[in-house]
Amino acid sequence: ASGSASGSASTLVHNGTSARATTTPASKSTPFSIPSHHSDTPTTLASHSTKTDASSTHHSSVPPLTSSNHSTSPQLSTGVSFFFLSFHISNLQFNSSLEDPSTDYYQELQRDISEMFLQIYKQGGFLGLSNIKFRPG
Amino acid sequence: SVVVQLTLAFREGTINVHDVETQFNQYKTEAASRYNLTISDVSVSDVPFPFSAQSHHHHHH
């Protein structure tokens, strides 16, 4: 069974920012938006809060990406390669929290994985990651 | 254990499947240390274009 809740918002995370695009289970389109000129995408430097795993709140000016010239409906430009990646995390146990994107456990794991990939592939060509799903091993 | 599935996007021509997997495997140890995630059974595959939201399920090894 898939570990992601149906109809949840998925995020393309890239370069420390994120662009949101909501999909429904029936959607056949790409569940994220990639601006055609990624490096030139304008950002809105609005403060946001991130819940941490100590139940504190972090305030910074590292914002979600806002594309002023693009709608939130999924878009694709040519010149993009996609790779599907899967792996096991052997020191974690799957539980129902990983089926619910609103839980702290889900959000913490998603945050860690997103940050890890942003760092591993930050040099050259990486546009982002999307559709993180969790399921039992 | 937990299986994680996701999609990575790159500018076309900048990386191939082998390099995606190699780079990820290179940092598995650091991931264990930094994020407390012990990673194994890494699998990477191309997602054919046009991409669909369901294409995950056809490419899991």
Epitope: G16, T50, H58, S60, E115, I120 | S33, N36
Partner: antibody
């Protein structure tokens, strides 16, 4: 020149909380992790946790989870570590130290604050 | 958690002596870091990734090892080298430190 400057010594009663600050300068604050490490008198160094100022993401040693809060104020290039429900065993020098994201993680914690002495006593 | 055991816990040596400190891990690690600490001061990164000298560290210091056994060696001890040395692993979370080796003047 890279510098991490910590707040001054604190004396606290058991059950209280303490908040230690660590102001960074000489580099781009959001590019590096900040770690917190403590050292009780005559004891080995003990790792507490980290925060990534670029995202606010953090992680804690299970020993301290639930009692420690690590935050940053990016506009002030300052990290904070708050430890609650203090007990006498928390008497220690608390250090902040910066390190690197991938792929430079293996460089280690290369700059440290001068340390903040926290004394817990009734 | 991975335990790091340093030996000896302390040693007395003279200027010019060759000194070796060992760090043994309870399970295999990819690499270790070494820190130098003097009384009342913060630790300083001394050797990173097992064998790389940190900035400003004299070439008389060297590090080696793999798996579970690592060493820090000073080829010819100098007065400024008297301090406590700690090893650290970061192959497993949480990072852990050895108990330290205090190098004293004989």
């Amino acid at each position: 020149e890279v510098q991490l400057v910590q707040s001054g010594a604190e004396v606290k009663k058991p059950g209280a909380s303490v908040k230690v600050s660590c102001k960074a300068s000489g580099y781009t604050f959001t590019d590096n992790y900040i770690n917190w490490v403590r050292q009780a008198p005559g004891q080995r160094l003990e790792y507490m946790g980290w925060i990534y100022p670029g995202s606010g993401n953090n992680k804690f040693n299970e020993k301290f989870k639930g009692r420690v809060t690590i935050t940053v104020d990016t506009s002030a290039s300052t990290a904070y570590m708050e430890l609650s429900s203090l007990r006498s065993e928390d008497t220690a020098v608390y250090y902040c130290a910066r390190d690197y994201p991938f792929p430079s993680y293996h460089y280690g914690m290369d700059y440290w604050g001068q340390g903040t002495t926290v004394t817990v006593s009734s | 958690d991975i335990q790091l055991t340093q030996s000896p816990s302390s040693l007395s040596a003279s200027v010019g002596d060759r000194v070796t400190i060992t760090c043994s891990a309870s399970s295999s690690v990819s690499y270790i870091h070494w820190f130098q600490q003097k009384p009342g001061k913060a630790p300083k990164l001394w050797i990173y990734s097992t064998s790389n000298l940190a900035s400003g560290v004299p070439s008389r210091f060297s590090g080696s090892g793999s798996g579970t056994d690592f060493t820090l060696t000073v080829s010819s001890l100098q007065p400024e080298d008297f301090a406590t040395y700690y090893c650290q692993q970061r192959s497993s979370y949480p990072p852990t430190f050895g108990g330290g080796t205090k190098v004293e003047i004989k």
